[in-house]
Amino acid sequence: KKEDGESTAPTARPKVLRCKCHHHCPEDSVNNICSTDGYCFTMIEEDDSGTPVVTSGCLGLEGSDFQCRDTPIPHQRRSIECCTERNECNKDLHPTLPPLKDRDFVDGPIHHKHHHHHHHHH
């Protein structure tokens, strides 16, 4: 039994963190900013042609630990980074594509070049 003065209705968790969103903006976002109770993220992945595409936005608290863990997906090159330390922190994230594995070389010379990307995180 609830104590007097305590609400029985669940209280909505406030959306306290604002994130930059790019290719991943909800309909109610303004000026490419979304709000979340969880994390900001930036993700880079290759599309079907091999072009790197960056998306960024908000992740809800529920399930975000798993999503931010960046579990490798076979035959898909992608990388995600998450942050919560301040509003719009994800504009400073710089995920880079993972290095190619031998089994990714099946598509011919297009995939045989190595990345020269530096993996510094300043």
Partner: antibody, heavy 119, light 107 residues
């Protein structure tokens, strides 16, 4: 000597189709990506997209989806850009530009092809 | 798409001067920025890639630096043949975008 030699200038009426060629020499076409870049008169550079020269799969920037098509004739070491239903705003110089695969800076540029609309 | 804000638009300098051009990215680009030179009536030429790497055959008076969102291109001692428009470009994410250009004119 590595070169990208493009076809000559074109004068087109609105609604017509133009096809620009870019012939690669001094390297194997299929070991580098081929990008296309637009430069409108007195303006900056705009990346239109690229074609994966090994698989033949093209990718287009959002502003160039629909009327624009990239293609290859690998036996002739040549890449093509086709513009359908030519419009006034397509008046520009078009460059092909080579990129090391999985790197996206452009180390060799074509000679450029100027396409102008004639009313 | 990501915006590369390039400044200044114009530079009027004397031969022998030092010149600096800046590009500010709308998002962290890491080292993924290149610089190009386009002389009048010519195609662009790659000068710098990965922010600070000089391309083959580029004179050492041309240098690049920066990381993240702030990038700088410098000509240590301008020569008459450096008359051109200079562009930065982010090569991190599609669509790959260019700065608006800096026109370098020699007095």
């Amino acid at each position: 000597q590595i070169q990208l030699v493009q076809s000559g200038p074109e004068l087109k009426k609105p609604g017509e189709t133009v096809k620009i060629s870019c012939k690669a020499s001094g390297y194997t076409l299929t070991t580098y990506g081929m990008n296309w870049v637009k430069q409108a008169p007195g303006k900056g550079l705009k990346w239109m997209g690229w074609i994966n020269t090994y698989s033949g799969v093209p990718a287009y920037a959002d502003d160039f989806k629909g009327r624009f098509a990239f293609s290859l004739e690998t036996s002739a070491s040549t890449a093509y850009l086709q513009i359908n239903n030519f419009k006034n705003e397509d008046t520009a110089t078009y460059f092909c530009a080579r990129s090391e695969l999985r790197n996206w800076y452009f180390d060799v540029w074509g000679t450029g092809t100027t396409v102008t609309v004639s009313s | 798409s990501f915006v590369m804000t390039q400044t200044p638009k114009f530079l009027l300098v004397s031969a022998g001067d030092r010149v600096t051009i800046t590009c500010k990215a709308s998002q962290n680009m890491g080292h993924n920025v290149a610089w190009y030179q386009q002389k009048p009536g010519q195609s662009p030429k790659l000068l710098i890639y990965y922010a600070s790497n000089r391309y083959t055959g580029v004179p050492d008076r041309f240098t690049g630096s920066g990381y993240g969102t702030d990038f700088t291109f410098t000509i240590s001692t301008v020569q008459a043949e450096d008359l051109a428009v200079y562009f930065c470009q982010q090569d991190y994410s599609s669509p790959f975008t260019f700065g608006s250009g800096t026109k370098l004119e020699i007095k």
